[in-house]
Structure formats: structure tokens, C-alpha cells
Interface confidence: medium
């Protein structure tokens, strides 16, 4: 039988009812055009929607917008437009929310092409008040908050001047023309690249990377002939052009620019890119395109440091620069990531990796599900999963997976079980174990989204007819109620819930088309009385993670420690609460060839937990450039996983010698770079 | 290329009611607005009101509120108007038009296809 | 409802005549008004849409213009198929339609 329709499915009692009591429909007066929702701090219950309606005119196109406030998460909201004088504000910037909960909210309006700049509007008390400021400059950029002051301002001009706030957009400083690209670092630093030439286009490659730590009362170049430049984790990335030909390097600093290392990556060509995945504290998964328009490249993990790096994945899909990746960070499992590989066929195929980039494999076929035509043997075949590559290329995906640092183990995504990802009409694909099991939770694409800590999932037909029922599972997608949340059928344009998935009010939202005129709706249910009581001790059982094997003693060993997590049962019906807190249990692993990655020079063969020596190093010395100076490094061929924890056990050799010898990286070496003040 | 065709033509006695099909062939139906409008003998256009098939929900000119009941099928690509409490002044050419719509914008194209017209006399 | 009042309701012109006919709205209906022919015994058929735009297959001698609560339809040479009935047309919120210009030859 089709999930969730079997007999051993309890049924939710009474919950028409009590859904029907805590259902609130809005209808927003006379609106088209688009809408955009954003959620302004954490458990506040502060929504603001800014829709706005262009009318093309044969000359220009002039809009209209509204803006409407709700404080009780979207049940009721109140058109507060004249707060922002009745101006049309610039989707394209959206509503810059601050950080954290500090309330502050910044507005970009259209204003007239004669004004010597642009306009804001600000707020700092969660959209109850507004303040218009008028700008010195024209912004090019939506303003970005500092992540440590929320007064702190930084943006782009349409002249490509950097401009910062001192005070929340109330007065601006020009602080540096010629700018290309600003990032906010720690600390309130700032790091800019900037022309000198003719432009950011023009000087591509002959950028200098700029930091300021005093919002632009001193400067310091820390790096030239720079192509790009980014930030993750702890690191801080360049891509320099070499000195003899058009080719880049990444270059890699912990220093916030200080000093810098060559990282051990190859070196990119002018139609090629590096692109950063993910990065923490620990370390980086980087991609490095192939050369030619191959539309795939290789993953590779780097050390703590983020110099040395190892081959991950071979072939991995990455369209442009810019481009489409599935590459996909599995927040609801230590160390588990998913994306998609092109193989010699061309076909899709989707990939995990349970260890953080350490070994690769295919997801296992879900129990409850047939091979599709991909398959050329019907009884294996695995389960590929739809991402962002699957959306760009218009196929039947309205989401993209999903999983919720606070919903243990759970992770929804759309796929198709077979040798490889199928262009037919996905079905809507469950784990509870971080990935390493899949259930087929609905039949057909769908919005699902995930409330109350996994408590409640709550889902919709992706249709192109309108629609008016809602499914909802409280015990992890095996069993689904539909609940009629309106008579007349919407046109379906969204599912909202406040980011971190611990809300029980979901909004559905879409348009009503009447004859002539259609209007925006939004219908808030709140699941409240669904869990009618709070969640007691004996509602959670102890689930050891990433448990393959519990005979062994290793058994869920994982980046060098496991993890025991209390989680709900599944048979609970009862609420986590906004207060809920992830419980769980580490303790140290003995260390195993697993908790070592391959380093440089070496790879491991698939299926083998060995790292073998590259066939092109055989023999070389493995040196490389480390602050400037060259590094001979003595080693059998493992590193340690940044992050492992392990103890005891397999203890490999590694060392590092300094050679003594200057090694040149393209960089401006630390004692040459200059610094000057304005 | 769309063509919406009617049924034929109706004679009524006064107090009954009349319902007036339109099918539509060669094009989709769902998304489209689908307009009802009458003309009187020697008289101008007059809206009746209109439909959009997806979605079930009609519009009526506030003159003919509670005596028409517009409809449709999309299974079939039909559209129903029916008119009741038929007096003798409700003798006229009716009319369905298909009307070109943006889904979600209000966006007025027009009446691009209009269909052949059904003649209803009511007379006693 | 909007009302639509048409002028003039009779008009006798000759072939090559420049003709304008024009449409006046109760309220302000933006630029959803459209313009239509008919001939007698026959469904109307639609010229203009929203004020101005010209409809596929319709000759470029016919044109509208206007925004608000003024609307003119013109044609700009007078040809001996264009002799019928013309009905401007609101489409803000409901419909309604003028109360026709008859063109005739002089």
C-alpha cells in the first residue's frame, strides 16, 4: 500500500477540528505582482511582507508596494505602509534583516533618476517604527550588517565606492573608491578588493585585496594580482594569477591576511573556477573545475590548516562558475554531505559521504521501492536525489533537501530509485538516520517543510491546479492526515515557517483568483493542539548515530568519537517546544585508518581503506610552500581528519621538516606588504 | 487555433430557465477567463459575467445576481451559463468569449474568441 | 459598477476619413479598456486591448490611446470593411461595456 495508508497508522483524533480552530486566513487588499516574507529575529513572531506591483509603461516602469507587519507569525498582519511614506521599495535588495535578534531592519526604496542617491528605510524595534534616511550615494548592493556589531554597515555604490555606518545607516562614509567585492570578516574587519585600472571586469587578475580592521581609518594590502577572494570557517581564500601564464592559485591565511600559503590545489585556467562548498572551523570542501566545458570537477577536503588537500570525489557535477551544484550539507548528522557526480555516461548519479568527505558511496535503495527504466538490474539500484541542478534544469522539483540541525537524523528530499537520477516525476524520499536508510514518504513532488523539531512534517502537492489540503505527519513521514485548510483553492506559491524549525504555525501562501483581479493570501495553521501536551522523558528514546554494526565495538564511530541522541519516538504525539535542546551523549574512538584522510601525494582507491601513493609522485620528493618557506614532509601516506577526536589505536608517521629554502607563492610576502592610514 | 462553439438556439416561456453550453476545441481551456455577454435585439453588448475554469469561481454583473449561475467543466472544455426566471426581456443573442489573463497578475487582454452566439426567445 | 459612456453614438464617414471615436470611464480604469468590432449578425471582434496594444491580425490603421478615464479609438483611413458598430469596454474589476458607435457611410 502507498505510504502512510496501511493499517497500522493511527489516526490524529479530532484534528479537523482543532486545526480548523487555529487556521487564520489573511487576504491582502488589491494586490499582484510579487510578494517576499521575511522573518525579523528568532521567536518573535515578527513577520514582514513587502509585495509590490510593477506596471510596465511604454517609457519605464513604475511600482507600487505595500508592506504588511504580523507579530503573532503570520495569524493576523497589518498593512503598515505609511510607516515607509508609501514608497516603492526595490525587491532586488530585499528587506536586509540584522542579525541575531537585534530587530533591525533596512528598506531600499526606488527613487527618482535625478536624486543625487538612493534612500532607506530603518528600523530598529522590529518594523514597529521606520526611519527614512536619505543616502550620499546610489547602492549597488543590499547594505550588509557586521555579524559582531549590528550598527556596523557596509555597502556598495553604483560608482563602486565602499561606504560604511557607523550607526545603523544614519550617516555614511565614503571609505574606499574602486571597490569590487566587500566582505564583513570577525572582528568588524573588512576585506575589499580593488581596481586600479579601468574596473573590476577589466583589472580581473590585477585586483588588490585590501583589509581594514578600524572601518576605514587604516588600510593594509595583504594581497595583489588577485581574481577573487572568499571567506569560510576560519580561512580566508585568494585566487592569484600566476606570474607566468593566465592560470590562478588559491592561496590560503588564518591571519586574516597577514601571512598566507599556497594551498596544494592545481591551478585553475581562465574558463575554470574554484568554488568553496563548505567550510568551518575544522576545515574546507573546495572545488576545482575541470579544464573545458566538462560541467564537473573534483572535491577536494583540506587539512586544519587548509593548504594541504585530498582527493575527495572524482567527476563531481559543478555547471559554470556561478553555477549548479547539488552539494548539500546534511545539518541534522555530524558529518554527513550528499551531491551529485557525472559519470562517463552522462547520466546524474547521487553520492554521500557519512565522514566528512573521507569515502563516497551511492545512497542505498529505499525498502518500499521498485528500480525504475535507469536500472539495469532490477533488483539493484540505488536512490539519486533531486537538488539544485535538478531545479535549475526545470524538472518536477519544487524543493531541495532538507534537514534541520535540531530534527536529529532527518532528511526529505525529492528523488528516484534506479542506476541513475531519472527525468520522470520524483516521488518524495524520508531517512531518519541521517541518510544511511530511505523510506518513500509521498508519491509525486511536493513542499514539505519541518516544525517543531521533526515533530511535525507538514506537506504540499506541488500542483500547477489550485489547491486547498494540506498533509501533516507527526511520527517522521510514515503516516499522513490531509486536512482541507480552506473551500476555495488557492493558487500555491509558498509554504513559510520561521527558520530553525522550532515554530508549530506554518503559512501557506498563494493567490486567489477571482474574475478580473487576484489577491494575496496567506492562511497561518497553528499545530499547537495537534501536540497537545509537552514531551516527557518517556517520549525519547537513546538512537546511536551513524550505527551500522552493533556487534562492533566501533560501532558508530565517526570522526574519531560517536554519538548517542535522546529522540522522540515516533509513536509520541506531543510537542518538543520552542525550548527543545538536542540531547546527546560523545564518547572517544580508538583511532582506525578511517579517521585519517590521504595526504598530499597519496589517494585512496575506492572501496579500500589504504591510501596509496600517487602514481605521478612515485619517488618525488613531496614538497610544497608553507608562509614562504618550502617544506619537505616525510609521511606514510595518512593525515588526521580535521575534527577527529580519536585516540590511541593506529597512529600513522607525519612530519614536517623546514627546508630552509624561500619559496615564492605569487603573494606579496608578509614583510613587503604595506599599510597606510586615512 | 481555439474556437468556442455554442448550443442552439432555445425557446422559453416566461418564468423558466435556459442553459447555454460553449465548448471549447483546438486549445487549452483551464487558464483562460471565459466571459458570458448578451445582446438584446437593436441593443448594445451587456456583460453577464465570467469564469475561470481552474479555478470554479464565477463573477456576476450585480444586474443579474441570483438568476445567473455560470459553470464549467474542464474536463470536457464546456462552459455552462444558466439563466432563470426568464422574462421577455431576456429574449437576445448570448454570447461566451474566451479572455486572455496572466495567472496571478491582473492583467486584462481582452475578449480574443467569442463563439457563434445562441439565440433564446422567451416568449409565452 | 464603472460606466462607459461612448460618443458618438451615430457617425456617417467616407472611405479615406480619419475616424475618431472616443470613450469616457465614470472612474478611472487605468488602461484596462478594450475596443471591439462588430458586424450586424456576427459575435464582435476584439481590435484593441488595454488601451492601446493592437491585437494580432487586426490592420495597423486602427489604434487607441488614453489612460484613465479618456480613451479614442482612431482610424486612420477609412476602409469600406471598417463600416459597423464599435464598443469600447472597462475591464476594471467587473466588465462594462459603452453603448456603441454606429459607422456609416456618408
Known amino acids: 500500500s502507498a505510504p502512510g495508508e496501511d493499517e497500522e497508522c493511527g489516526r490524529v483524533r479530532d484534528f479537523v477540528a482543532k486545526l480548523a480552530n487555529n487556521t487564520h486566513q489573511h487576504v491582502f487588499d488589491d494586490l499582484r505582482g510579487s510578494v517576499s516574507l521575511s522573518w525579523v529575529g528568532d521567536s518573535t513572531g515578527v513577520i514582514l511582507v513587502l509585495t509590490t506591483f510593477h506596471v510596465p509603461l511604454v517609457i519605464m516602469t513604475f511600482g507600487q508596494s505595500k508592506l504588511y507587519r504580523s507579530e503573532d507569525y503570520g495569524k493576523n498582519f497589518k498593512d503598515i505602509t505609511d510607516l515607509i511614506n508609501n514608497t516603492f521599495i526595490r525587491t532586488e535588495f530585499g528587506m536586509a534583516i540584522g542579525p541575531e535578534n537585534s530587530g533591525k531592519v533596512v528598506l531600499t526604496a526606488e527613487v527618482s533618476g535625478g536624486s543625487r542617491g538612493g534612500r532607506i528605510f530603518r528600523s530598529s524595534d522590529f518594523a514597529k517604527n521606520f526611519v527614512q534616511t536619505d543616502l550620499p550615494f546610489h547602492p549597488l548592493t543590499q547594505m550588509m550588517y557586521s555579524p559582531q556589531n549590528s550598527d556596523y554597515l557596509l555597502a556598495l555604490s553604483t560608482e563602486n565606492g565602499l561606504w560604511v555606518s557607523k550607526n545603523f545607516g544614519g550617516k555614511w562614509e565614503e571609505i574606499h573608491k574602486a571597490v569590487c567585492l566587500a566582505k564583513w570578516g570577525s572582528d568588524n574587519t573588512i576585506f575589499f578588493t580593488t581596481y586600479a585600472n579601468g574596473s573590476c571586469k577589466a583589472d580581473l587578475g590585477a585586483l588588490e585585496l585590501w583589509r581594514t580592521s578600524d572601518l576605514g581609518k587604516s588600510f593594509k594590502t595583504i594581497g595583489v594580482k588577485i581574481y577573487s577572494f572568499g571567506l569560510g570557517g576560519r580561512f580566508l581564500f585568494a585566487s592569484v594569477m600566476a606570474d607566468k601564464d593566465t592560470t590562478r592559485r588559491i592561496h590560503v591565511s588564518t591571519d586574516q591576511g597577514d601571512t598566507w600559503s599556497m594551498a596544494q590545489l592545481p591551478s585553475v585556467g581562465q574558463e575554470q573556477f574554484y568554488s568553496i562548498l563548505a567550510a568551518n572551523d575544522d576545515m574546507v570542501f573546495m572545488h576545482v573545475d575541470e579544464p573545458g566545458d566538462t560541467g564537473f570537477g573534483t572535491i577536494f577536503t583540506s587539512d586544519d590548516r587548509g593548504i594541504v588537500y585530498s582527493k575527495s570525489l572524482d567527476r563531481h557535477l559543478y555547471t559554470t562558475t556561478g553555477g549548479e551544484t547539488d552539494f548539500t550539507n546534511v545539518t541534522s548528522l555530524r558529518g554527513v554531505y550528499i551531491t551529485s557526480v557525472l559519470s562517463e555516461d552522462n547520466s546524474i548519479q547521487t553520492m554521500i559521504t557519512f565522514d566528512q568527505g573521507g569515502r563516497w558511496t551511492h545512497l542505498r535503495k529505499p525498502e518500499n521501492s521498485e528500480c525504475d527504466a535507469t536500472a539495469k538490474n532490477k533488483n539493484e539500484c540505488s536512490l539519486h536525489i533531486h537538488a539544485s541542478y535538478s531545479i535549475s534544469q526545470k524538472l518536477n522539483v519544487p524543493m531541495a533537501p532538507l534537514s534541520e540541525p535540531n530534527a536529529v537524523g532527518i532528511v526529505i528530499a525529492h528523488g528516484s530509485v534506479g542506476d541513475a537520477i531519472s527525468v520522470m516525476v520524483p516521488d518524495v524520499y524520508i531517512s531518519d538516520d541521517g541518510g544511511y536508510s530511505w523510506t518513500k514518504m509521498l508519491e509525486g513532488p511536493h513542499y514539505y517543510t519541518i516544525l517543531d523539531s521533526g515533530g511535525i512534517i507538514v506537506a504540499i502537492e506541488h500542483s500547477s491546479r489550485p489547491i486547498n489540503v494540506i498533509k501533516f505527519s507527526t511520527d517522521e513521514g510514515q503516516c499522513w492526515q490531509t486536512y482541507t485548510f480552506t473551500r476555495d483553492p488557492i493558487y500555491f506559491t509558498g509554504l513559510a515557517s520561521e527558520p530553525g524549525a522550532r515554530s508549530m504555525n506554518i503559512s501557506i501562501w498563494g493567490f486567489t483568483e477571482s474574475f478580473l483581479t487576484s489577491q494575496w493570501v496567506s492562511y497561518t495553521i497553528d499545530f499547537k493542539d495537534i501536540l497537545e501536551r509537552n514531551c516527557e522523558e518517556k517520549d525519547y528514546t537513546i538512537w546511536l548515530a551513524h550505527s551500522t554494526d552493533p556487534e562492533d565495538y566501533e560501532d558508530g564511530c565517526i570522526l574519531g568519537y560517536k554519538e548517542q541522541f535522546l529522540r522522540l519516538r515516533k509513536s509520541s504525539v506531543c510537542q518538543n517546544g520552542r525550548d527543545y535542546v538536542v540531547t546527546k551523549q560523545p564518547s572517544i574512538c580508538l583511532c582506525s585508518l578511517e579517521d585519517f584522510l590521504c595526504d598530499f601525494g597519496y589517494y585512496r582507491p575506492e572501496n579500500d581503506s589504504k591510501c596509496v601513493e600517487q602514481p605521478e609522485l612515485k619517488g618525488h620528493d613531496l614538497e610544497f610552500c608553507l608562509y614562504g618557506r618550502e617544506e619537505h614532509l616525510t609521511t606514510n601516506g595518512y593525515r588526521k581528519i580535521p575534527g577527529d577526536k580519536c585516540q590511541g589505536g593506529v597512529n600513522p608517521v607525519r612530519e614536517v621538516k623546514d627546508l630552509k629554502k624561500k619559496c615564492t607563492s605569487n603573494f606579496l610576502s608578509p614583510e613587503k606588504q604595506n599599510s597606510k592610514s586615512n | 487555433q481555439v474556437q468556442l462553439v455554442q448550443s442552439g438556439a432555445e425557446v422559453k416561456k416566461p418564468g423558466s430557465s435556459v442553459k447555454v453550453s460553449c465548448k471549447a476545441s483546438?486549445?487549452?481551456?483551464?487558464?483562460?477567463?471565459i466571459s458570458w455577454v448578451r445582446q438584446a435585439p437593436g441593443q448594445g453588448l451587456e456583460w453577464m459575467g465570467g469564469?475561470?475554469?481552474?479555478?470554479?469561481?464565477?463573477n456576476y454583473a450585480q444586474k443579474f445576481q441570483g438568476r445567473v449561475t455560470i459553470t464549467a467543466d474542464e474536463s470536457t472544455s464546456t462552459a455552462y451559463m444558466e439563466l432563470s426566471s426568464l422574462r421577455s426581456e431576456d429574449t437576445a443573442v448570448y454570447y461566451c468569449?474566451?479572455?486572455?489573463?496572466?495567472?496571478?497578475?491582473?492583467?486584462?487582454?481582452?475578449?480574443?474568441?467569442w463563439g457563434q452566439g445562441t439565440t433564446v426567445t422567451v416568449s409565452s | 459598477d464603472i460606466q462607459m459612456t461612448q460618443s458618438p453614438s451615430t457617425l456617417s464617414a467616407s472611405v479615406g476619413d480619419r475616424v475618431t471615436i472616443t470613450c469616457r470611464a465614470s472612474q478611472s480604469i487605468s488602461s484596462w479598456l478594450a475596443w471591439y468590432q462588430q458586424k450586424p449578425g456576427k459575435a464582435p471582434k476584439l481590435l484593441i486591448y488595454k488601451a492601446s496594444s493592437l491585437e494580432s491580425g487586426v490592420p495597423s490603421r486602427f489604434s487607441g490611446s488614453g489612460s484613465g478615464t479618456e480613451f479614442t479609438l482612431t482610424i486612420s483611413s477609412l476602409q469600406p470593411d471598417d463600416f459597423a458598430t464599435y464598443y469600447c469596454?472597462?475591464?476594471?474589476?467587473?466588465?462594462?461595456f459603452g453603448g456603441g458607435t454606429k459607422v456609416e457611410i456618408k
Open positions: 469596454q472597462q475591464a476594471d474589476g467587473h466588465i462594462t
Open positions: 483546438g486549445g487549452t481551456f483551464g487558464s483562460y477567463a
Open positions: 469564469i475561470i475554469p481552474q479555478f470554479g469561481t464565477a
Open positions: 468569449a474566451r479572455q486572455g489573463r496572466k495567472t496571478g497578475y491582473y492583467y486584462y487582454y481582452g475578449m480574443d474568441v
